[in-house]
């Protein structure tokens, strides 16, 4: 499989909710010994490869922002990200998202989704997607977020 980002750029007025989405495309290994681990973090546009830097999203690091798979227990502090305006969602079609509520210009940056395929006695397979969030200060609350493709946004796969 691979990870794609339906939109590579989100432009949101301050105060709106921004939902950033990644999508797993293609067949995902099934079976008791396979876990798909999905998480989110902030990064920067590195010279060699994007998504190499790991920065927290509203002080939550990548292990706090997991979409819990079949083997991964829900976080004991699972509701804490919600208290800080962060919500995780996923469906059975491979889509998964993070919603940032009431965005401010400080939320602007490069967001990365990371999908890891875990198989027993196998190395991790890592897949990345990235998208830019630009929050415009002082825009009216009536306007909504705009999502667009500024370039071909298929992610690079790194094992």
């Amino acid at each position: 499989f691979k990870v794609t980002t339906p939109y590579s750029l989100y432009v949101c007025p301050e105060g709106q909710n921004a939902t950033l989405t990644c999508r797993i495309l293609g067949p995902v290994s099934k079976g008791h010994d396979v876990t798909i681990y999905k998480t989110w973090y902030l990064s920067s546009r590195g010279e060699v490869q994007m998504c190499k830097e790991h920065r927290p999203i509203r002080n939550f690091t990548l292990q706090h922002l997991q979409h819990h798979g079949s083997h991964l227990k829900a976080n004991a502090s699972h509701d804490q990200p919600q208290k800080h305006g962060l919500e995780l969602a996923s469906d059975h079609h491979g889509n998964f998202s993070i919603t940032l509520r009431n965005v401010t210009p400080r939320d602007s940056g490069l967001y990365c989704c990371l999908v890891i395929e875990l198989k027993n006695h196998h190395p991790e397979q890592r897949f990345y997607g990235s998208m830019e969030l630009q929050v415009q200060a002082g825009k009216g609350s009536g306007s909504t977020c705009m999502a667009s493709n500024e370039q071909d946004s298929d992610s690079i796969t790194a094992a």
Partner: antibody, heavy 118, light 107 residues
């Protein structure tokens, strides 16, 4: 605050087995790998392998496959490493460390010294 | 297995000096390497990840660079508390392996 608390030093006889523990606090135990690393004086750091608690996924360094066995108990948030058929070559400090999937060894335990002597 | 080679086992430096430690991978590891600091009697601590990014709370005198097979760890102005052994480690594919370590002595 994320911490890994390791069990105390062990003095063992050759041929015996020892079980070292590593108790995690401050995060969801099942969300990160527990790594095991060996350090002998003058030998630097050697990776023995890893376990993902809750799933019991393991990856072993081939060199230590017949020496080390990893287990984890999610009810007590504790990972264990058993070393069997001990020899003087197994005398070392053993560290556990946490690794979020896809990332690096970001938190380390204080280490457990194992001495094998007759 | 990927072999990580730190060519200098020991380096001697003075407070205020700039010092660079090198690490060479036996095959291309992209930027999937980390640098750890181990002070005497302590466990290792993560300083640099993904070749060039400082871990949380790490002073900005510590920097990392490189990609592929050649990596450098630099302390721009050595402090007395930087006396330690520094290890590189790749995380490209298992087994993860460490360099042999470089012991930094302060004159």
């Amino acid at each position: 605050q994320v911490q890994l608390q390791q069990s105390g030093a062990e003095l063992m006889k050759p041929g015996a087995s020892v079980k070292i523990s590593c108790t995690a606090t401050g995060y969801t135990f099942s969300s990160c790998w527990i790594e095991w690393v060996k350090q002998r004086p003058g030998h630097g750091l050697e990776w023995l392998g890893e376990i993902l608690p809750g799933s019991d996924y393991t990856n072993y360094n081939e060199k230590f496959k017949d020496k080390a066995t990893f287990t984890a108990d999610t009810s007590s948030d504790t990972a264990y490493m058993q070393l069997s058929s001990l020899t003087s070559e197994d005398s070392a400090v053993y560290y556990c460390a946490r690794r979020p999937p896809g990332w690096y060894f970001d938190v380390w335990g204080a280490g457990t010294a194992v001495t094998v002597s007759s | 297995d990927i072999v990580m080679t730190q060519s200098h086992k020991f380096m001697s430096t003075s407070v205020g000096d700039r010092v660079s430690i090198t690490c060479k991978a036996s095959q291309d590891v992209s930027t999937d390497i980390a640098w750890y600091q181990q002070k005497p009697g302590q466990s290792p601590k993560l300083l640099i990840y993904s070749a060039s990014y400082r871990f949380t709370g790490v002073p900005d005198r510590f920097t990392g660079s490189g990609s592929g097979t050649d990596f450098t760890f630099t302390i721009s102005s050595v402090q007395a508390e930087d006396l330690a052994v520094y290890y590189c480690q790749h995380q490209y594919s298992t087994p993860w392996t460490f360099g042999g370590g470089t012991k930094l002595d302060i004159k």
